[in-house]
């Protein structure tokens, strides 16, 4: 069985998570993309793009915005006004149909904590960019630049760019892609 290694990201309530998922291969350009959360062992689709995807045509579902750039092989995910209950495991996926998706990225373990007033972390303006590139193995690929597994939110008005992993993957074998059932 294949297990994905997650990366942990810590935020305060009210902040914004921004994730960029890099899917690169042309065969996925016109596929629907989705942002899912693991609930127990079952993934739940929170938002998915339209089909066919259009460049810079955002899809908004509540506090989640998906923006697909099929001509550049990028999916941008934004979750605003984070709440403690948003904590959990998230993934970008290529959405095939309700029962199956292709997971292309190591999961993000989001930890949202209560922000105490007056602390730097409680600013709603503070955004952390997380860059995802395809993973073809169960093990997380080591980052090109040394960075901790746990990333704590930066002070307001600043952006921390976390790039994991450092090099792009040559997806020559479709069996490298992990398939998981999806129930929504």
């Amino acid at each position: 069985t294949t297990e994905l290694t997650e990366e942990k990201y810590e935020y305060k309530e009210g902040q914004t998570l921004e994730v960029k998922c890099d899917y690169a291969l042309e065969k996925y350009a016109n596929s629907r993309k989705a942002w899912q959360k693991m609930e127990g062992k079952m993934p739940k689709i929170l938002a998915k793009t339209e089909r066919p995807s259009e460049n810079s045509h955002p899809v908004q579902v509540g506090r989640i915005t998906l923006e697909d750039y099929p001509d550049h092989g990028l999916l941008q995910v934004q979750m605003t006004n984070l709440q403690v209950e948003d904590s959990g495991l998230y993934q970008c996926v290529i959405y095939q149909h309700p029962k199956e998706s292709h997971v292309l990225f190591n999961p993000i373990c989001l930890v949202v904590t209560k922000g105490s007033s007056g602390t730097p972390g409680s600013s709603e303006n503070s955004t952390q960019n997380v860059y995802r590139t395809p993973s073809t193995t169960a093990k997380a690929l080591g980052p090109r630049y040394t960075s901790p597994r746990t990333v704590t939110q930066a002070p307001p008005e600043s952006t921390v760019v976390v790039s994991t992993p450092g090099s792009e993957i040559n997806l020559t074998n479709v069996t490298d892609i992990i398939r998981v059932p999806v129930f929504n």
């Epitope: 960029k20 899917y23 690169a24 065969k27 750039y69 092989g73 792009e168």
Partner: antibody
Amino acid sequence: EVQLVESGGGLVQPGGSLKLSCAASGFTFSTYAMHWVRQASGKGLEWVGRIRTKSSNYATYYAASVKGRFTISRDDSKNTAYLQMNSLKTEDTAVYYCTRDMGIRRQFAYWGQGTLVTVSS
Amino acid sequence: DIVLTQSPDSLAVSLGERATINCRASESVDTADYSFLHWYQQKPGQPPKLLIYRASNLESGVPDRFSGSGSGTDFTLTISSLQAEDVAVYYCQQSNEDPYTFGQGTKLEIK
């Protein structure tokens, strides 16, 4: 190991035609866009054009300097990309490289050794 | 078309010293905060070799004395400590828009 091997270069007269081939191995050819880049002797690199994959309807894109004269095609069953060059001009004289990117609009990670095309009377 | 202008055209640096090459784009080569700007090294009689992709990512197998930075329209390739084998021509290239374009090249020599 990814390998790209160009062939078909040679001497041709102005106004003539030539077809270059790029034989690919070591990867799933049908998955990637293929590009042609050229370099005149002692000059810089010039992107010639690219052909996308079947999922992108084999769309092609060209530099303005070759548009209407050059045609890029591919045969996924033969793992080969082609560059058909018509109405050749002396300024088309160059080494022609076949390259493979790392995905949509990604970098050129793999290059062939190049084939020399000389357009002269 | 996006025009990439490299500076300087040629550069002579002493062994062990830092070499810096700049690349300026006529318009932004960024999409969704990704810079589609890459750096290549070419030695005589050889095809180009990828050094840096998407502005700052070191290609596998490339020595870490090479680094890239920048976003939008202004980019820099830096060699922290020049080695004899770094003598070559260096090119920037953008893939954000068709047609893809290269800079005119920068020739790096040893002083």
